[in-house]
């Protein structure tokens, strides 16, 4: 996994100090990655919370800075950075020493094989005359007298170390300050030297330039600064990165980082720099991390302190010991990838003197299998064969080589191959949106198999045809909009996803079914009349036009502005050209208008109108209660409606028959402060009914109904009459 | 050939009153909404007013509430804006145009106008 | 009420060019939409109506798309004859508003 964490020992300030993580993954922060995480790892050493919170600042997915220390015992212990995803996730350690600590490493990072013996070995930066105590992960494991120190140093001595050796060492002045230890790490790699796998049955490709081979997969862990299958190539000065594609930031290059990678690697300065502030310069004769490799170069070549032997024409190798006469396999890339059950021709190129020829270029596989080239071309400075390689499976995955020998000697150069299976989705697409002819489609799915996507094609058809699929290509990164569709239809919806390369295209994945929207409603209604049926009803009436009609129902929309509320009435009914609305707050300002729907779908709203519906009246009169005085008369007594909604203007009175069939006739009391009425000129011996409301700005609700019968033997009349103080009046009929 | 043309427009002064008339023709006249929409001199495309087949349904811009009334006599064929308290931002020329019949997408008939000034 | 906004208010283009105008509804007006183009002292005309659909004798260069709140009208490769003012205006809701309109010039 090339992740990378960087930290910048010439800041001594913690409040300028941070720690850098840079993931140079290959689709490193696809939105399904988990993200990068940076942070203090307290579980061993353990110091004072910080005075103020970390922060954590990303550039893009794939790099992480975490800064806001406040004082220099924030930055002591351990940080770690974790990234990559599913089983590839890793973690790298970094382990900050404080640079006025009691005791300081000779080297913090130590990387052994199993069975090796390790020394750590700390040395004396302020005197303390008390014992010093080693622990192992936070617990006791040693103490040495003060006095045992050798040369201004305390050493301690593991034998024999095996895998649970591994972790963080300390080295502490008794009764001192933690943060005045000595932090170290010990990596011991699961296998003995230059083996790896199951078993350590495996050979380590030979890592060269101090890369570490990788217990589990027998990669090369390269220092910062080298690159390939066995970190035989030098980045350009400040550059780092499993490719150099990673630049060292400002203007001194990579003087003064700490570079931390994966296990079993560890930490080390930059190519090129050593010391524990990684501020010196290598030695002449010097080079690589931590300077700790040496030139040696032979036949004129010439010491960089970056990439080692700068050879002379006519030579080559890692100390210009090779001739240009032995043959030389040239340039050929470190790494290649195909994907699974493709048959890729794979080239090697050869020089030197005698010319290679067709049967002495070979391709080694994994599995030990040699292959003979099929065809070579010959140029005047090159031999290249061609060899066609059997349908790959991933069995073929690993380190194959091409070897070239002949009379003037031999080379090989191994390369790694990476089979690769084609992505296939596991969920179908997603719908974003949809209209009456278009849907509008994420074509992001989660998939098996390898990543990079290079391009997503979705197949579209409508549900249950048979019809061949309409296929689009489209931008994985991008939402797809899917157009010409028909109305109101279901369609199948399926993902192919390709990675790059000959043979990248996966199997289909699941398909969705999608569903068209309904053609929109275009046709906009008119209001034709409406009409206050009381102080909380009101009918409405609307129109369309004569064409034809696609709708459902319609949508009554009434807002009431001073309450800032709106009011739906939905009509379910597309015939539908009336409406009564029923429970409206009375005495309210309505703006009303009609709209046609069609499935979800609102046509065009009608011009809206405005109505007023008027406020409610008062409550009924109270205790209502009738006697009959004559053959004629019938006085009514009640008392005033319990708190009416304002000064009552005048009360009305229902007269009707009983059992009669005639409309009822009503008289006003316009005074509004009595509460009786003799009521004149009734009918003999005649059973009547009788109620009351009052009025305020409306007309109030109706009392209870009262019965009562004249007395027998008088004249017939004409029609009841009210008695007034001052002149008699009529019904209103 | 549907036709509409615009009359009634001139100089009057501010909080004068005015109306404005739009003969239609070349179609059933009683079937189709109205509109009025006008444009001040240099400036863009303000709508005014609708009226529906009828009559009964009618509707305004904010800016000309309570001061215009739009009204129609289907027997004359004939679109009305009674425009009152008339203001110098009201100087426009005036068009009417036909509603497209229940369908709201779009005026493909306009008369040619009718300029209306407030000025004192 | 629904407020309509065009951008650019004026643009300059080269004929042949493909020129692109956009039409901004406060809220959402479904595919209620209409484009119209007047030039200087003419009557507007209609050219796209609901939002996407070519009036009948506009030629094809011209086209309108979108839904919602985001609109276009474009102008494929533009002609002399297509200086004027381009006017968007929405049917959603009464009072029918319209854009402030976009003026277009031949460079």
């Known amino acids: 996994v090339d992740l990378t964490l960087l930290a910048n020992l010439r800041i001594t300030d913690p409040q300028r100090f941070f720690l850098t993580c840079v993931s140079g993954e290959a689709g490193a922060g696809r939105s399904s990655d988990p993200p990068l995480l940076l942070e203090k790892d307290d579980r061993i050493v353990r110091t004072f919370p910080p005075g103020q919170p970390l922060y954590l600042a990303r550039n893009g997915s794939h790099q992480v800075t975490l800064r806001g220390f406040s004082k220099p015992s924030d930055l002591v212990g351990v940080f770690s950075c974790v990234g990559g995803a599913g089983a590839r996730r890793t973690r790298v350690l970094y382990v900050h020493n404080s640079p006025g600590a009691h005791l300081f490493p000779d080297k913090v990072t130590h990387t052994v094989n199993k069975g090796d013996t390790a020394v750590l070995s700390a040395h004396v930066h302020k005197e303390k005359q008390t014992d010093v105590i080693w622990k192992n992960n936070g617990s006791y494991f040693n103490t040495l007298d003060w006095q045992e120190a050798d040369d201004g140093r305390f050493q301690l001595q593991l034998q024999n170390v095996q895998p649970p050796s591994s972790g963080i060492y300390s080295a502490t002045y008794l009764e001192a300050s933690p943060l005045g230890s000595a932090f170290f790490r010990l990596i011991v790699r699961g296998c003995g030297a230059g083996r790896w796998g199951p078993g350590c049955v495996k050979d380590c490709p030979g890592c060269l330039h101090g890369g570490v081979c990788h217990d589990h997969d027998g990669e090369c862990v390269c220092p910062p600064g080298f690159t390939g299958t066995r970190c035989e190539q030098a980045c350009r000065e400040g550059r780092f990165g499993q490719s150099c594609q990673e630049q060292c930031p400002g203007t001194a290059g990579c003087r003064g980082l700490t570079f931390c990678l994966p296990d079993p690697y560890g930490c080390s300065c930059g190519s090129g720099w050593r010391g524990s502030q990684c501020q010196e310069a290598c030695a002449p004769g010097h080079f690589g991390a931590d300077c700790r490799l040496q030139c040696q170069c032979q036949n004129g070549g010439t010491c960089d302190r970056f990439s080692g032997c700068v050879c002379p024409s006519g030579w080559h190798g890692v100390h210009c010991e090779k001739s240009d006469r032995i043959p030389q396999i040239l340039s050929m890339a470190t790494e290649v990838e195909f994907n699974i059950g493709t048959m890729p021709r794979i080239n090697c190129a050869a020089a030197g003197n005698p010319f290679p020829v067709r049967g002495s270029m070979k391709l080694r596989k994994p599995d030990g299998t040699m292959l003979l080239s099929t065809k070579v071309i010959v140029e005047p400075d090159r031999t290249t064969a061609e060899f066609e390689v059997p349908s790959l499976t991933l069995g073929d995955s690993g380190f194959w080589e091409c070897r070239v020998s002949t009379s003037g000697g031999q080379d090989s150069r191994r390369f790694k191959v990476n089979v690769k299976v084609p992505p296939v989705p596991l969920t179908a697409p997603r719908l974003l949106a949809k209209q009456s002819r278009q849907l509008v489609v994420s074509p992001l799915v989660s998939f098996s198999g390898d990543g990079p996507i290079s391009s997503v094609r979705l197949h579209y058809r409508p549900q249950d045809s048979t019809i061949a699929w309409s296929a689009i290509v489209v931008d994985p990164s991008e939402n797809v909009t899917l157009m010409n569709l028909k109305p109101k239809t279901g369609y199948n919806v399926r993902v192919q996803l390709s990675r790059p390369g000959e043979g990248g295209e996966g199997g289909w994945g699941p398909s969705a079914l999608m569903t068209t929207d309904c053609p929109e409603p275009l046709l906009q209604p008119w209001l034709e009349s409406w009409h206050v049926e009381g102080p909380d009803r009101l009918r409405v009436s609307w129109s369309l036009p004569s064409v034809p009609l696609s709708g459902d129902g319609f949508l009554l929309r009434l807002w009431d502005g001073a309450r800032g509320q709106e009011r739906r009435e939905n009509i379910s009914f597309p015939q539908a050209r009336t409406a009564l609305l029923t429970g409206l707050t009375p005495g309210t300002h309505y703006q009303l208008d009609v709209r046609l729907y069609h499935c979800t779908l609102l046509g065009p709203a009608s011009p809206p109108a405005h109505v007023h519906l008027p406020p409610s009246g008062p409550p009924a009169p109270r205790h209502l209660h009738a006697q009959a005085l004559s053959d004629s008369e019938i006085q009514l007594m009640w008392q005033h409606p319990e708190a009416p909604s304002g000064p009552i203007s005048k009360y009305i009175v229902e007269i009707q028959v009983a059992g009669g069939s005639g409309d009822p006739q009503w008289m006003d009391v316009d005074r509004p402060e009595e509460t009786s009425i003799i009521v004149r000129g009734l009918n003999a011996s005649t059973r009547y009914l009788f109620r009351v409301r009052a009025s305020v700005q409306g007309l109030g609700d109706w009392s209870n109904t009262v019965e009562e019968a004249t007395l027998g033997n008088g004249l017939q009349s004409e029609g009841p009459v009210r008695e007034s103080r001052a002149a008699e009046e009529g019904l209103d009929q | 050939e549907v036709q509409l043309l615009e009359s009634g427009g001139g100089l009057v002064q501010p909080g004068g009153s005015l109306r404005l008339s739009c003969a239609a023709s070349g179609f059933t006249f009683s079937m189709y909404g109205m509109v009025w929409v006008r444009q001040a001199p240099g400036k863009g495309l303000e709508w005014v007013s609708v009226i529906s087949p009828s009559g009964g349904n009618t509707g305004y811009a904010d800016s000309v509430k309570g001061r215009f009334t739009i009204s129609r006599d289907n027997s004359k064929n004939t679109l009305y804006l009674q425009m009152n308290s008339l203001r110098a931002e009201d100087t426009a020329v005036y068009y009417c145009a036909r509603a497209p019949r229940g369908y709201s997408y779009g005026y493909y008939y306009w008369g040619q106008g009718t300029l209306v000034t407030v000025s004192s | 009420d629904i407020q309509m906004t065009q951008s650019p208010s004026s643009l300059s283009a080269s004929v042949g060019d493909r020129v692109t105008i956009t039409c901004r509804a406060s809220q959402g007006i479904g595919h209620y939409l209409a484009w119209y183009q007047q030039k200087p002292g003419k009557v507007p005309k209609l050219l796209i109506y609901?939002?996407?659909t070519l009036q009948s004798g506009v030629p094809s260069r011209f086209s309108g798309s979108g839904s919602g709140t985001d609109f276009t009208l474009t102008i494929s490769s533009l002609q002399p004859e297509d200086v004027a003012t381009y006017y968007c205006?929405?049917?959603?809701?009464?009072?029918?508003?319209f854009g402030q309109g976009t003026r277009l010039e031949i460079k």
């Open positions: 205006q929405q049917f959603n809701s009464y009072p029918h508003t």
């Open positions: 609901t939002a996407s």
